[in-house]
């Protein structure tokens, strides 16, 4: 009797969670909200954006998605952000977003239309059917890397990094065993797509987790690995410890505060 609980045989069962519930409605609603808030994107037709998004993965095998599939969406979502105000992040998304919410002239990928649309969502389709798979989607490790979500983030991350210029900032999680992880989106995509002809310096902000953690995490071997990769690409590297992220945010909000002249 238990076989009734299984997904029908013809539907591929993947290792990762399925498409986020109400995915089409969520994408459309986010698009409308974003274009209302950002005047420079008011020209965007959200129905067309959804159609292009859908077209990238619907009726396609979810392990056979290419960057090419997302080109119509990329074209519709083309957006100019100040190239010298880009904040990348790795494994510390929440603080990065809190920062750009205060420092409004700086932008993470998720502050752009395409990043905003897809943030925290999962999606995939099925080969030869127009259905969205709400049961399961391919896991990057266990199933395949060329899945709809991974290819999307690889595509938008590459474009975002390619657009950067002057000094690019990256927020890194000092509490992780690998502060810089070569396998992260930052380490595998963004680092290699910064353009030395445009980017002069990558400045890493290493965010400390512990209250009493006064170690210089810029000496971490993985930071030195990042430094080496960046320097070999003819980009200067700068590293700063953010010992007190709470105070750091507070000082971004109130730079005149007398306690904000000391190291944060």
């Amino acid at each position: 009797h238990h076989h009734h609980h299984h997904v029908p045989r013809w539907r591929q069962q993947w290792s990762g969670p399925g498409t986020t519930k109400r995915f089409p409605e969520t994408v459309l609603a986010r698009c409308v909200k974003y274009t209302e808030i950002h005047p420079e994107m008011r020209h965007v037709d959200c129905q067309s954006v959804w159609d292009a998004f859908k077209g990238a993965f619907i009726s396609k095998h979810p392990c056979n998605i290419t960057e090419e599939d997302y080109q119509p969406l990329m074209k519709l979502g083309t957006q100019t952000v100040p190239c010298n105000k880009i904040l990348l992040w790795s494994r510390i998304k929440d603080l990065a977003h809190q920062f750009t919410q205060v420092q409004r002239d700086m932008f993470t990928l998720e502050d752009t239309l395409l990043g905003y649309l897809a943030d925290d969502l999962t999606w995939c389709g099925e080969f030869n059917t127009s259905k969205i798979n709400y049961q399961s989607c391919p896991d990057w490790r266990k199933d395949c890397s060329n899945n709809p979500v991974s290819v999307f983030w690889k595509t938008v991350s590459r474009r975002f990094a390619e657009a950067a210029c002057d000094v690019v900032h990256v927020m890194l999680n000092g509490s992780r065993s690998k502060i810089f992880d070569k396998n992260s989106t930052f380490g595998s995509v963004e680092v290699h797509n910064l353009q030395p002809e445009k980017v002069q310096t990558l400045e890493a902000w290493v965010i400390h987790g512990g209250r009493e953690d006064s170690r210089d995490l810029c000496q971490d071997p993985t930071i030195k690995e990042l430094e080496s990769i960046i320097s070999k690409r003819n980009i200067q590297f700068s590293c700063k410890n953010i010992y007190r992220p709470d105070k750091f945010l507070q000082c971004v909000k109130n730079p005149e505060d007398s306690s904000c002249t000391s190291e944060i």
């Epitope: 810029c218 590297f237 590293c239």
Partner: antibody, heavy 119, light 107 residues
């Protein structure tokens, strides 16, 4: 505050090795690269080379065969050795700190030390 | 190596005048250019990096511009303390190279 100071003999004989030391304070050699530059009297500046914070070095190809830069982090000292000197190596020698962790230009300089090559 | 050429070699000017110093690279240096000021018996002092970014404590009368191979340092109104030699440096590729300098002297 950040300070750099060059020291070493002011007179070196031709064919000998010029040896200078740069002593730094106000920052750690594990955090910044140190560059050596020189300026012949009345002339322009020439970059000699750099020792990065991790200990690797880059040298000016025109001097590479004669130059060695090393450091003793615990003493906050960087040394420059230039072998087989000639009168053309007479110059004011400067050490300078890279502006950022791996910086390709210089925000703090030593006051410079004049080295004359003469017999 | 990239050759940096500064012009003119010497400028004779009076306080209050506007000064434009030129620096040309033998190939595109992609805005990797700094300017230094050097006074007799002193080490160079960093003024501007990345073509336009003024170092802290450098007066706003100094400004930089340019792209590709051609770059300019402008002093909007010469002050007595500005008479010195000015060097440009490229940091696009090693060996990092300097111009031969422009001497700004009192007329």
């Amino acid at each position: 505050q950040v300070q750099l100071q060059e020291s070493g003999p002011g007179l070196v004989k031709p064919s000998e090795t010029l040896s200078l030391t740069c002593t730094v304070s106000g920052f750690s050699l594990t955090s910044y690269g140190i560059h050596w530059l020189r300026q012949p009297p009345g002339k322009g500046l020439e970059w000699i080379g750099v020792i990065w914070r991790g200990g690797s070095t880059d040298y000016n190809p025109s001097l590479k065969s004669r130059v060695t830069i090393s450091k003793d982090t615990s003493k906050s000292q960087v040394s420059l050795k230039l072998s087989s000197v000639t009168a053309a190596d007479t110059a004011v020698y400067y050490c300078a700190k890279g502006k950022v962790t791996t910086g390709f230009y210089f925000d703090f300089w030593g006051q410079g030390t004049l080295v004359t090559v003469s017999s | 190596e990239i050759v940096m050429t500064q012009s003119p070699p010497t400028l004779s000017l009076s306080p209050g005048e506007r000064v434009t110093l030129s620096c040309r690279a033998s190939e595109d240096i992609y805005n990797r250019l700094v300017w230094y000021q050097q006074k007799p018996g002193q080490a160079p002092r960093l003024l501007i990096s990345g073509v336009t970014s003024l170092e802290t404590s450098i007066p706003a009368r100094f400004s930089g511009s340019g792209s590709g191979t051609d770059y300019t340092l402008t002093i909007s109104s010469l002050q007595p303390e500005d008479f010195a030699v000015y060097y440009c440096q490229q940091y696009w590729s090693t060996p990092y190279t300097f111009g031969q300098g422009t001497k700004v002297e009192i007329k």
